[in-house]
């Protein structure tokens, strides 16, 4: 899901050209340029899976792909938390693993990624429409969730593949003070590369005083802002919801899946990092034109049921309110 | 900072059932999510449980499976513990707490007497 | 259900003394999946609820002097204060953070000269 990038270089203009705006063209732009290419955006992948032996039982498993540290991870089903979801399961590093019925067992199986058994009988029991989210609060990314559900025609025993989530929900608290400066750095650095359109602009060339140049990721924050505030929400239609039991539910067991390598708690280094993991690693651009997402040299990914996207329009207090009125 | 308020103290007869409530005042998430906890005279904590106020679910120490029960009222912000078929084994403070116990209520006496 | 252990029940020591007690649990409360340990400590002073101090063994709550340190890893875990405060009078308790039921252990009672 990451694109590699070399910086390039900005030649001074010729002298002259600029005049006293000669120093503030070359160094703002550089800057700006800068800061736009290299700022980092986490991801988050789900993975939702029917156990051919009980058909009520799923496992849902989260990672988060992404340099900060996480503070809590919230497993919810029938949409995001928040937005009608009700949560099965919240997760916090060092303070503890809390569930809910349907949920039987959470679990960390590495220090980014989670998972969560679910089973149930009768009213209690999710069903292949379900859909599944998780959300992972870190710092300094702010909050990030992905939702993924069985495609309608997968067989038990057989997983949908993890939803690679390019960018899918970004509770603005976390991110826009950042995403407002990058926002306006950027926007004025088009501002400034218009303006110079017709006239004689620096050169660019390939960095050689470098061996590599920062990373560039496909959504900067700023980017990722903006698709929250013109995205709307996703509406999801699902026969299953869930029932309350009241039912304790101890942690432990085995985990039905090998774990995820140590490194998904640091920032992958390129698609080469994640080639031995169930996620899909391959270069994408994400579009926030007309609300629209598109791989690069790809069709528009489908959402479908593996697959929602959930932007957080309501701003920094989005999560205040009684009792998860949020 | 998240303020647990609970209600005042309950003195009751044997065989009684009392309701003691946890009135939650949050900004986060987790605020809203409640354990409740015992704590007999001069003797340690006990988990009774957690509720969840998505689903009003909850999670019993089998202990108090049948003695409490635990539900939330999300419009108001207010968790509930109910307790039944009262014995002086109940008499206690009884605590509510948040999600990872950060935050604590007061405590309410219960006193069953007679 | 796991049966969380302490020691010594009482410690009488002097203001600016250094103190240490001890929590044994009957499994181990480390998380292998991300190897943090769900251990958490609570001061009790008389007439208030508890407040917790540290948490994943070793992480001081904010607000929490760093006269406070917790250590320990699977099933032995030690509460030290490194210089004793007159304010320190107080019940601690450790708790298995673990797994449900979240069990306390039976405290440890601080007494000052």
């Known amino acids: 899901m990451r694109t590699e990038a070399q910086v390039p270089a900005l030649q001074p203009p010729e002298p002259g050209l600029e005049g006293a705006m000669g120093h503030r063209t070359l160094v703002l732009p550089w800057v700006l340029l800068t800061l736009c290419v290299t700022a980092g955006t986490p991801e988050v992948w789900v993975q939702v899976r029917m156990e051919a032996t009980e058909l009520s039982s799923f496992t849902i498993r989260c990672g988060f792909l992404g340099s900060g540290s996480i503070s809590l991870v919230t497993v919810s089903w029938g949409g995001p938390n928040g937005a009608g979801g009700t949560t099965l399961a919240v997760l916090h590093p060092e303070r503890g693993i809390r569930q809910w019925a349907p949920a039987r067992q959470a679990r960390w199986e590495t220090q980014s990624s989670i998972s969560l058994i679910l089973e149930g009988s009768g009213a209690s029991s999710p069903c292949a429409n379900t859909t599944f989210c998780c959300k992972f609060a870190s710092f300094p990314e702010g909050s990030w969730e992905a939702c993924g559900s069985l495609p309608p025609s997968s067989d038990p025993g057989l997983s949908a593949p993890p939803t690679p989530a390019p960018i899918l929900r970004a509770d603005l608290a976390g991110i826009l003070g950042v995403s407002g400066v990058l926002l306006f750095g950027c926007v004025y650095l088009l501002h400034l590369l218009r303006r110079h359109k017709h006239r004689p602009a620096p050169r660019l060339q390939p960095s050689r005083t470098s061996p590599q140049a920062p990373r560039a990721r496909a959504w900067a924050p700023s980017q990722a802002s903006q698709a929250a505030l013109h995205v709307p929400y996703a509406t999801i239609n699902t026969s299953c919801r869930p029932a309350t039991l009241d039912t304790a539910h101890p942690h432990g067991g085995p985990s039905w899946w090998a774990s995820l390598p140590t490194h998904a708690a640091h920032r992958p280094q390129g698609p080469a990092a994640w080639a031995s993991t169930p996620i899909p690693a391959r270069g994408s651009f994400v579009s926030v034109e007309n609300g629209l997402y598109a791989q690069a040299g790809e069709r528009p990914p489908h959402t479908g049921p593996g697959l929602t996207l959930f932007p957080d329009p309501r701003g920094p207090r989005a999560m205040e309110g009684p009792l998860g009125v949020r | 900072e998240v303020q647990l308020q609970q209600s005042g103290p309950e003195v009751v007869k044997p065989g009684a059932s009392v309701r003691i409530s946890c009135k939650a005042s949050?900004?986060?998430?987790?605020?809203?999510?409640i354990n409740w906890v015992k704590q007999s005279h001069g003797k340690s904590l006990e988990w009774i449980g957690d509720v969840n106020p998505d689903s009003n679910g909850a999670n019993y120490n089998q202990k108090f499976k049948g003695k409490a029960t635990l539900t939330v009222d999300k419009s108001s912000g207010t968790a509930f513990m109910g307790l039944r078929s009262l014995t002086s084994e109940d008499s206690a403070v009884y605590y509510c707490?948040?999600?990872?116990?950060?935050?604590w209520g007061q405590g309410t006496t219960l006193t069953v007497s007679s | 259900d796991i049966v969380m252990t302490q020691s010594p029940s009482s410690l009488n020591v002097s203001a600016g003394e250094k103190v240490t007690m001890s929590c044994k649990s009957s499994?181990?409360?480390?998380?292998?999946?991300?190897?943090?340990?769900?251990l958490a400590w609570y001061q009790q002073k008389p007439g208030q609820p508890p407040k917790l101090l540290i948490y994943?063994?070793?992480t001081r709550e904010s607000g929490v002097p760093d006269r406070f340190t917790g250590s320990g890893s699977g099933t032995d875990f030690i509460l030290t204060i490194s210089s004793v405060q007159a304010e320190d009078l107080a019940l601690y308790y450790c708790?298995?953070?673990?797994?449900?039921?979240?069990?306390f252990g039976g405290g440890t009672k601080l007494e000052i000269k």
């Open positions: 499994q181990s409360l480390l998380n292998s999946g991300n190897q943090k340990n769900y």
């Open positions: 994943g063994a070793s």
């Open positions: 707490a948040t999600l990872f116990f950060d935050n």
């Open positions: 708790q298995n953070a673990h797994s449900s039921p979240y069990t």
């Open positions: 949050g900004n986060t998430f987790t605020d809203f999510f």
